[in-house]
């Protein structure tokens, strides 16, 4: 396994609709044909997998149908979007990139993006 640098923003604020987007960029000394991207969430010293996708270079990322993640790739950048977030989902979201093919295998783990989610205030009842 060879180490690889992965960069991601330090902080992102989710939208009022519970959507957060960030870019995960990896620096490899060459072009892989098969890349796996995994989003991990670290909260209270526990790490859980949020979503994962394997893609062929030049093709779109394909997450599972029930995944809360979507994404696109461009060169060595992956644009990730996480949907359906609520205040309780606030935490550190870590981007893990694996170059699966060709060998050798490269692994890179970002420092994480702190995603802050604020639940919207419920709309007050209106007399109109």
């Amino acid at each position: 396994c060879k180490a690889m640098h992965v960069a991601q923003p330090a902080v992102v604020l989710a939208s009022s609709r519970g959507i957060a987007s960030f870019v995960c960029e990896y620096a490899s000394p060459g072009k892989a044909t098969e890349v796996r991207v995994t989003v991990l969430r670290q909260a209270d010293s526990q790490v859980t997998e949020v979503c994962a996708a394997t893609y062929m270079m030049g093709n779109e990322l394909t997450f599972l149908d029930d995944s809360i993640c979507t994404g696109t790739s461009s060169g060595n950048q992956v644009n990730l979007t996480i949907q359906g977030l609520r205040a309780m989902d606030t935490g550190l979201y870590i981007c893990k990139v694996e170059l699966m093919y060709p060998p050798p295998y490269y692994l890179g783990i970002g420092n994480g993006t702190q995603i802050y989610v604020i639940d919207p205030e419920p709309c007050p009842d209106s007399d109109f």
Epitope: S28, P29, G30, A32, T33, P102, P103
Partner: antibody
Framework: DVQLQESGPGLVKPSQSLSLTCSVT?????????WNWIRQFPGNKLEWMGY???????NYNPSLKNRISITRDTSKNQFFLKLNSVTTEDSATYYC????????????WGQGTAVSVSS | DIVMTQSQKFMSTSVGDRVSVTCKAS??????VAWYEQKLGQSPKALIF???YRYTGVPDRFTGSGSGTDFTLTISNVQSEDLAEYFC?????????FGGGTKLEIK
């Protein structure tokens, strides 16, 4: 440590074939990476000639048309360059190199072998 | 083919100075650019990959920058051992292509 070493004749006659060997130590050429031939002309211009990948696939520079062939002997951990119908324009220093992926940075280079095409 | 142009064939600098070597790609190559140093009588040595990432063991006075079509290798606090020729290379697409080289001369 990974080492690449080129070998072959330093003088080739025009219209003949140029054949070079790259011997690799410290890493199996079937385990990974892409294994290239690059040449440097007088004046220092560099040209990528082609590669053979860890799984035996090849890719060549279109500028060399059908003159080039890269093969390997996995039992000896060597790969080879054959360039047919050479002219004086093929006089150069020839390097074998290694890079990651399909398109990448050459992280290891041989010391190079000078080839002169002359009658 | 993608053409990599290093417009300055020679650059002269002094020990302790800062010098920037430039490279222009004929089309967008993202950050798929490498830089090499070649000292007289030696093979090229990889310095930078992915436009801005140093290889292990490369002194931090070497810095790569740029994306798209314009790239720069900056050497700060130039040392006498930096006397060499510097080449850029694109690896966005085949055939892989190199710049023509920039020779650094130390005054």
């Amino acid at each position: 440590d990974v080492q690449l070493q080129e070998s072959g004749p330093g003088l080739v006659k025009p219209s003949q074939s140029l054949s070079l060997t790259c011997s690799v130590t410290g890493y199996s050429i079937t385990s990974g990476y892409v294994w290239n031939w690059i040449r440097q002309f007088p004046g220092n211009k560099l040209e990528w000639m082609g590669y053979i990948s860890h799984d035996g696939n090849t890719n060549y520079n279109p500028s060399l048309k059908n003159r080039i062939s890269i093969t390997r002997d996995t039992s000896k951990n060597q790969f080879f360059l054959k360039l047919n119908s050479v002219t004086t324009e093929d006089s150069a220093t020839y390097y074998c190199t290694r890079n990651y992926g399909y398109g990448g940075t050459m992280d290891y280079w041989g010391q190079g072998t000078a080839v002169s095409v002359s009658s | 083919d993608i053409v990599m142009t290093q417009s300055q064939k020679f650059m002269s600098t002094s020990v302790g100075d800062r010098v920037s070597v430039t490279c222009k790609a004929s089309q967008n190559v993202g950050t798929y650019v490498a830089w090499y140093e070649q000292k007289l009588g030696q093979s090229p040595k990889a310095l930078i990959f992915s436009a801005s990432y140093r290889y292990t063991g490369v002194p931090d006075r070497f810095t790569g920058s740029g994306s798209g079509t314009d790239f720069t290798l900056t050497i700060s606090n130039v040392q006498s051992e930096d006397l060499a020729e510097y080449f850029c290379q694109q690896y966005d697409s085949y055939p892989l292509t190199f710049g023509g080289g920039t020779k650094l001369e130390i005054k």
